[in-house]
Interface confidence: low
Amino acid sequence: MATKAVCVLKGDGPVQGIINFEQKESNGPVKVWGSIKGLTEGLHGFHVHEFGDNTAGCTSAGPHFNPLSRKHGGPKDEERHVGDLGNVTADKDGVADVSIEDSVISLSGDHCIIGRTLVVHEKADDLGKGGNEESTKTGNAGSRLACGVIGIAQ
């Protein structure tokens, strides 16, 4: 199994970043970390989407990776998409330093995210608590600012 993966985030605008993934054991947590720049200050939804297809930009990536057919939630929620990694926080310089440990995504098996698309969104993810239908699907996180296909790393 792969133990490391990487994603280069790019978009039509100024947002770009590099995100690393590391999983030391096949059933263990995945470390997700790196940096994203060019964001507006504040929270931005951060999700793994189903398809590794960026042919028409980030929209080609489809919905959140959700092999268990659950509703959208936060990374600490039982009811969540596999791809629900919550939010990243950009500072006043537009830089988000990412350091997440997640026990639902994996670099192998049914929850494998390799070959899928990582997306950073325009707005904050309400973690499924927004009170409308869109909240249970996307967290009302808005448009897709930048994305990249998650690939195996050395």
Epitope: N20, E22, K31, W33, T89, D91, K92, D97, S99
Partner: nanobody, 116 residues
Framework: QVQLVESGGGIVQPGGSLRLSCVAS????????MYWHRQAPGKRRELVAG???????YFADSVKGRFAISRDNTKSSLYLQMNSLKLEDTAMYYC??????????WGQGTQVTVSS
């Protein structure tokens, strides 16, 4: 509130080396990720390197193979060993913790100048 103090900066010729240190005012054992950033005059701040408590490391492409990061939780310290320095490495270097809550904790910086 964690206070971070960087040291070790200076003026060095291209190809030279420097070792930056960052000492925290209290234990860093519970701080998962610690980072070195840099900012050159007129440029956006850039994440250079980072290290988590379990030893996972991150390096910007521009410094891979030249810089090494380490931490010593017993000394509440973070280090950045910079080798084969280039003119473009000239910047103010800052030590920082994971921004949780944002913007995390930051030091005042130490200046690195690479000049021939």
């Amino acid at each position: 509130q964690v206070q971070l103090v960087e040291s070790g900066g200076g003026i060095v010729q291209p190809g030279g080396s420097l070792r930056l240190s960052c000492v925290a005012s209290e234990s860093i054992s519970d701080i998962d990720a610690m980072y070195w950033h840099r900012q050159a005059p007129g440029k956006r701040r850039e994440l250079v390197a980072g290290i988590t408590n379990d030893g996972t490391e991150y390096f910007a492409d521009s410094v891979k193979g030249r810089f090494a990061i380490s931490r010593d939780n017993t000394k509440s310290s973070l280090y950045l060993q910079m080798n084969s320095l280039k003119l473009e490495d000239t910047a103010m270097y800052y030590c920082a913790t994971l921004p949780n809550p944002p913007p995390g904790y930051w030091g005042q910086g130490t200046q690195v100048t690479v000049s021939s």
